[in-house]
């Protein structure tokens, strides 16, 4: 769920990583009200995640090893 | 209550590998992650890698990097650990941990320990 | 990888002891850190999470805070059985990290 580029909400659903093409931070202290992970797909859609949640963490890891080895 | 069970004790020569495993069961394994950590004889805790079954691909730290491979065969719930170019330095128990990939802590179970040891 | 500093490496203290131990990471690592404690030959146990949550079967007697890169866990009043190793762990981001432990032994 988002509005005006900012996550209001977290998805409910598990995302595979073969299906994500890259990701941005939201952080709560600029100007939006909460900090998430918007993961974005190859269907070019933005999903909103929560950053807290193990399997979020374990794909940010690997999308940022992915970007490293470029 | 989800239980991992490891293989048992090894002792290996220099410059082999060891593969271990570990096997959960009481809960939905492919709802979970599965961490290897280690530790050395009177040593802390070493996070070495894992794997969230469902994705399939294992993420590792970069001092095990291409000497550690992580897999997970979902048919049977179980988790492998193999470490290859083994040295006296590898002698450890080797802990497999697991928490729910939608959940906010990596290591809510652990398995009891595997000791490798390393040695001519 | 964010490195974890914890202190002291070792501490002795009575039954009914007050105990702390910190642990700084060298980045910002949120709330996302975690305390367990390990007794000889036994696999580590989860006591607190989140920084500050207690894990669910854990005595309050065992408190965590801290936010940032300054974490600190407390004893509130120390039992025979919490003679132990305990281990701050951050899972902010990958790699995930452990400080180095704080081994506490009866005075």
């Known amino acids: 769920a988002s509005n005006f580029d900012c996550c209001l909400g977290y998805t409910d659903r598990i995302l595979h990583p073969k299906f994500i093409v890259g990701f941005t931070r939201q952080l709560a202290n600029e100007g939006c009200d909460i900090n998430a992970i918007i993961f974005h797909t190859k269907k070019k859609l933005s999903v909103c995640a929560n950053p807290k949640q193990t399997w979020v963490k374990y794909i940010v890891r690997l999308l940022s090893k992915k970007v490293k080895n470029m | 209550q989800v239980q991992l069970v490891q293989s048992g004790a090894e002792v290996k020569k220099p410059g082999s590998s060891v593969k271990v495993s570990c096997k959960a069961s009481?809960?939905?394994?492919?709802?979970?992650?599965i961490s290897w950590v280690r530790q050395a004889p009177g040593q802390g805790l070493e996070w070495m890698g894992g794997?969230?079954?469902?994705?399939?691909?294992?993420n590792y730290a970069q001092k095990f990097q291409g000497r550690v491979t992580i897999t997970a065969d979902e048919s049977t719930s179980t988790a492998y650990m193999e470490l290859s170019s083994l040295r006296s330095e590898d002698t450890a128990v080797y802990y497999c941990?697991?928490?729910?990939?939608?959940?906010?802590?990596?290591?809510?179970?652990w398995g009891r320990g595997t000791l490798v040891t390393v040695s001519s | 990888a964010i490195q974890l500093t914890q202190s002291p490496s070792s501490l002795t203290a009575s039954v009914g002891d007050r105990v702390t131990i910190t642990c700084r990471a060298s980045q910002f690592a949120s709330n996302d850190v975690g305390w367990y404690q390990q007794k000889p030959g036994k696999a580590p146990k989860l006591l607190i999470y989140?920084?500050?949550s207690l894990q669910s079967g854990v005595p309050p007697r065992f408190s965590g805070s801290g936010s940032g890169t300054e974490f600190t866990f407390t004893i509130s009043s120390l039992q025979p059985e919490d003679f132990a190793t305990y281990y701050c762990?951050?899972?902010?981001?990958?790699?995930?990290?452990f400080g180095q432990g704080t081994k506490v032994e009866i005075k």
């Open positions: 794997i969230i079954p469902i994705f399939g691909t294992a």
């Open positions: 941990a697991g928490g729910s990939i939608t959940g906010t802590t990596p290591f809510d179970y």
């Open positions: 762990l951050q899972d902010y981001t990958y790699p995930l990290t």
């Open positions: 989140a920084a500050s």
């Open positions: 009481g809960g939905t394994f492919s709802s979970y992650a």
